[in-house]
Structure formats: C-alpha cells, structure tokens
C-alpha cells in the first residue's frame, strides 16, 4: 500500500513510510484540539487489494468552548449551531437594549483547550439624554432627564412676537431610538411667509388667504386666450419661496398658417403668410389651449374661502 490517508481531525502515530506490506497496520491519534470518543476505530490495515481498509476521523471530536448563557435581555447565537473551536458566537440584544462589549466572540484553541476570545457582552437598556432644545419652541416632557427606548417627545412653536406666526419645519414628534439616539433631528421654528403670488393675465382659484405661511397651497387659472406656463399649483416651502415657482400666463398664439395657392386663368402663385406675432423677437411659445376652469374646484365668485389665516 502507498502512504495511508490523512485526516483533518487525526494524525498518524509515527513517521509515514513510502509503502506498506499487506497486513501491516497503522494507528492514528486525535490531533491537538480534538479528543477521542470510543468506540470507532482509529487504525487501518493494508489489505490484499493494496488499499487501506476504510477508516474515518469521526471518532475525533473538536474541543468545544464553554457554554455561554444568553445575556440578560438578549441572545447568544452560535454561528453554525456549535460551540467547537474555529466557530463564532454572535450576540443580539432584544429591542430596547443595546450591546456593550464584543458583538462576536471566537472559539479559539489555547494549547489543547478551547476558550472564547473575550468576555461575553451585556445588553443595556436603551436610554436617551433629553432631546435638543429649539429656538422659538419647546418640547413635551422638558423636565424629564432620562428617556427610555421609544419614549417620544413632541415639539411645538412659541407664539411669535410679531404679526406672523412661527411655523414648525420638520417632524413634530421624535422618539428615543436604537443606540440611544433620537429618531431624527429636532424640527425648527421660524417665520415662513411667502410673497403674495400674483399672476398677470390669470387669477387664483383656490387657497385664498390673508397671508401665505408654510405649506400654504394655491391654485391658478389663466384668463381666456392665455395658457399656463408652469404648475397650476404651488406650495409655500420652508425657505419662504413658492415651490414650484409662481407660474406665468402666456398669450395663446395661433399657429402660422399657409394660404392655399391663388388660382387665376394663367399664373398660379403661393405665398406664406406669417402670423403678426411671429416677427416679434425671442422664441415664440408653441400653441397651447387656454386653461379653462378646473371642474371640481370652487370659483372665486362662489365665495368659497379657504382662508389660511
């Protein structure tokens, strides 16, 4: 027989020879980090076919690291369902708790003993420090010094000293989240007032109000013979500007028409007549139909007010 087989978990006792005689036996022992559990054989014999009798290293088991309990308010999850060396242990905390320490421990061999690479972590309750104070506003539970997981606070704006109120920009409610961090940045309180939206050759058809503050929404339509260039609906954004910008109402120009050939007894001539507007400087907008009243929207005449005041 040629050299005996090699295994991951056991090694040959003594030095291997280049060849073995029929009937010759070789013995194995468990490698470092593995231990023998009877009754499986750990030897083989060169049989008369010049092959080694079947043998496996199933009798040698990996050293295992000590059992780790689940941390309080968390779980220890063996990566491959085993505590054997060379494998990992993952730690997860329950919702509302966060990990202090290593998230992964490795089962390592020290000498012939399998030990964990570090101390198991602990799961600590998620606690948040008070959320930020904001200028011109306040939040609920301002007297509380420590917030637990998912505790929420709601911001509101102070009354403004002038005629225009403070608007709350952003989400009013934030909560204590993972890693002891608030779910989002605090909102801000500031005066947001958009300029009065005027459209020449058109008019506002909804969103009427004394003044136009944050998120005020206005709709327009154009007079007969004009078409809307831009959006018919605009919203006052946090920078005190209309988004999209205030539209324009542009004059509807008839398309240039070509006269049919003039007929006579002898000569036929054709000429192209330009629309008077086509000689004006600058690009001429393509024909668009005028914007009519929008069905379903109140007309100003109907006296339906959507006051934003």
């Amino acid at each position: 027989c040629e050299e005996p087989p090699t295994f991951e978990a056991m090694e040959l006792i003594g030095k291997p020879k280049p060849y073995y005689e029929i009937g010759e036996r070789v013995d194995y022992k468990c490698k470092k980090g593995y231990f023998y559990i009877p009754p499986l054989a750990t030897h083989t014999i060169c049989d008369r076919n010049h092959t080694w009798l079947p043998v496996s290293d199933d009798a040698c088991y990996r050293e295992t690291c000590p059992y780790i309990r689940d941390p309080l308010n968390g779980q220890a999850v063996p990566a491959n369902g085993t505590y054997e060396f060379g494998y990992q242990m993952h730690f997860i905390c329950n919702e509302g708790y966060y990990l202090i320490g290593e998230e992964i421990l490795y089962c390592e061999l020290k000498g012939s003993v399998a030990i964990w690479s570090g101390k198991p972590p602990i799961c600590e309750k998620v606690l948040c420090t008070p959320p930020p104070k904001i200028k011109n506003g306040k939040h609920t539970f301002s007297e509380v010094e420590v917030f637990e997981y998912l505790d929420a606070v709601t911001y509101s704006c102070d009354p403004a000293p002038g005629p225009d109120p403070f608007s709350l920009i952003g989400e009013s409610t934030i909560y204590c989240g993972d890693n002891s961090v608030w779910s989002r940045a605090a909102p801000e309180c500031k005066v947001v007032k958009c300029r009065f939206p005027v459209v020449e050759n058109g008019k506002q058809i909804s969103g009427f109000g004394k003044k136009f503050y944050y998120k005020a929404t206005v709709m327009f339509e154009c007079d007969k013979g004009f078409y809307l260039d831009g959006s018919d609906t605009i919203v006052c954004d946090s920078n005190s500007t209309w988004d999209p910008p205030v539209p324009k109402c542009l004059k509807v120009l008839p398309p240039s028409s070509t006269k049919p050939p003039a007929l006579s007894h002898s000569v036929s001539t054709s000429s192209t007549t330009k629309s008077p507007a086509s000689s004006a400087s600058g690009p001429r907008p393509t024909y668009k139909p005028p914007v009519s009243n929008y069905p379903g929207y109140p007309k100003p005449e109907e006296g339906i007010l959507d006051s934003l005041d």
Partner: antibody, heavy 119, light 107 residues
Framework: QVQLQQSGPELVKPGASVKLSCKAS????????INWVKQRPGQGLEWIGW????????KYNEKFKGKATLTVDTSSSTAYMDLHSLTSEDSAVFFC????????????WGQGTLVTVSA | GIQMTQTTSSLSASLGDRVTISCSAS??????LNWYQQKPDGTVKLLIY???SLHSGVPSRFSGSGSGTDYSLTISNLEPEDIATYYC?????????FGSGTKLEIK
C-alpha cells in the same frame, strides 16, 4: 417708524419727461415693495405698478407700460418713477406706498408729488 | 380689469352715528379687499386689509365685512377726525383697482 419722503411739485411741458423720487426711512429698504399710485385732480386712485428693491423685479398696470418706468437705488433707499411723453392726462398727484412681501395692501404712503403738465 | 363700484359718492352723517360705506366688485374677489382713508390734506392711510383685518393703530370703531362681490366698511361711532374720502381696493387680479371713493361729511 416707516417714512416715505417724496420729491417736490413739478411743472413740465407736454412731451417732456419727469423723474419723481421717494426716499424711504425707518425700515430695511429691501424688505418692502414700493408701489406707485396716481390720483387725478378730484378723482380716485389708480395703481401704476410696484418694484421689489431686493431683486429689482416689478409688475406694471398694463395701462402704464411705456408711460412709467420704476427703478430703485438701494444705496440711498430711494425709489424712482420716470414718466415719459407727458400730456395733460398725466397731470396728477403721484403717491409712493410700501407693501410688505408683495401683499397688495399699502400701510405706509408718501405725501404725494403734484405733476402739472402745461405748455 | 375688475371694476370696483362705490355707488355712494358722498355721505352726510352726524357725530356718533354708525356709518356704512359699500363697495361692489364686477366679479367675485374672494375677500381680497382693502379700505383706505384719504384726509382732505391728501394723506392716505390703510384702515382694513383682507376684508376685515384692522391695520395696526387704526381705531376699533372701524370694521370691515363682506364676501363674493359685496363689501362694506362700518364706522360705529363717527368722530370729527373721520371726515375723509374712503376708497376700497381689490387685489385678486392685476391690475389692482380702487373704487371711485365715498366722501364722508358731517351734517
């Protein structure tokens, strides 16, 4: 407090031009729009147009396009209105008035400038 | 443009009276209406904006109301300094237009 000081009376010949001024004080000039309003003797008020000093944007009453030109000088907090090709129809008192954020109500008015067009 | 009509060009009332000045628009103006006072010396003041909002510093005896096309200015207790011409002004549509004015006199 907001004050608007307008230039003195003008006597001009037909066909000529005139430049009226309106000096603002008591507020940040670029924060308010300047409007101009015409009042013919014994008659009502007519809005000419407005100019927004912050960006120089303006809107005119179609009737006064070509007749009036609105400008501002932010360094001196002064608004100007040029009136062109004057006729007797342009004899009137011209007021400047401010409005905030383009809201078309005019809380502060100048004292008015009388323009008389006569040969 | 939108025509603003003040049908009463002049009005006589006694001190202490309640006076109402009316103004109508040629089409609905959705409360986009202001009132001004012009004194005999020519000085102009804003009294009321957006139909019923009192401008700061204006006495509370002045009030405004209305909707659609019809609007009014009321002086609840006429005082000598209220002698003036009163103008309404719409601003729903360019050009902004004024009424022809109502001259208020003391009986």
């Amino acid at each position: 407090q907001v004050q608007l000081q307008q230039s003195g009376p003008e006597l001009v010949k037909p066909g000529a031009s005139v430049k009226l001024s309106c000096k603002a004080s008591g507020y940040t000039f670029t924060n308010y729009d300047i409007n101009w309003v015409k009042q013919r003797p014994g008659q009502g008020l007519e809005w000419i147009g407005w100019i927004y000093p912050r960006d120089g944007s303006f809107k005119y009453n179609e009737k006064f396009k070509g007749k009036a030109t609105l400008t501002v000088d932010t360094s001196s907090s002064t608004a100007y209105m040029d009136l062109h090709s004057l006729t007797s129809e342009d004899s009137a008192v011209f007021f400047c008035a401010v409005s905030e954020d383009g809201y078309p109500w005019f809380p502060y008015w100048g004292q008015g400038t009388l323009v008389t067009v006569s040969a | 443009g939108i025509q603003m009509t003040q049908t009463t060009s002049s009005l006589s009332a006694s001190l202490g009276d309640r006076v109402t000045i009316s103004c109508s628009a040629s089409q609905g103006i959705s409360n986009y209406l202001n009132w001004y006072q012009q004194k005999p010396d020519g000085t102009v003041k804003l009294l009321i904006y957006y139909t019923s909002s009192l401008h700061s510093g204006v006495p509370s005896r002045f009030s405004g109301s209305g909707s659609g096309t019809d609007y009014s200015l009321t002086i609840s207790n006429l005082e000598p300094e209220d002698i003036a011409t009163y103008y309404c002004q719409q601003y729903i549509k360019l050009p902004f237009t004024f009424g022809s004015g109502t001259k208020l006199e003391i009986k």
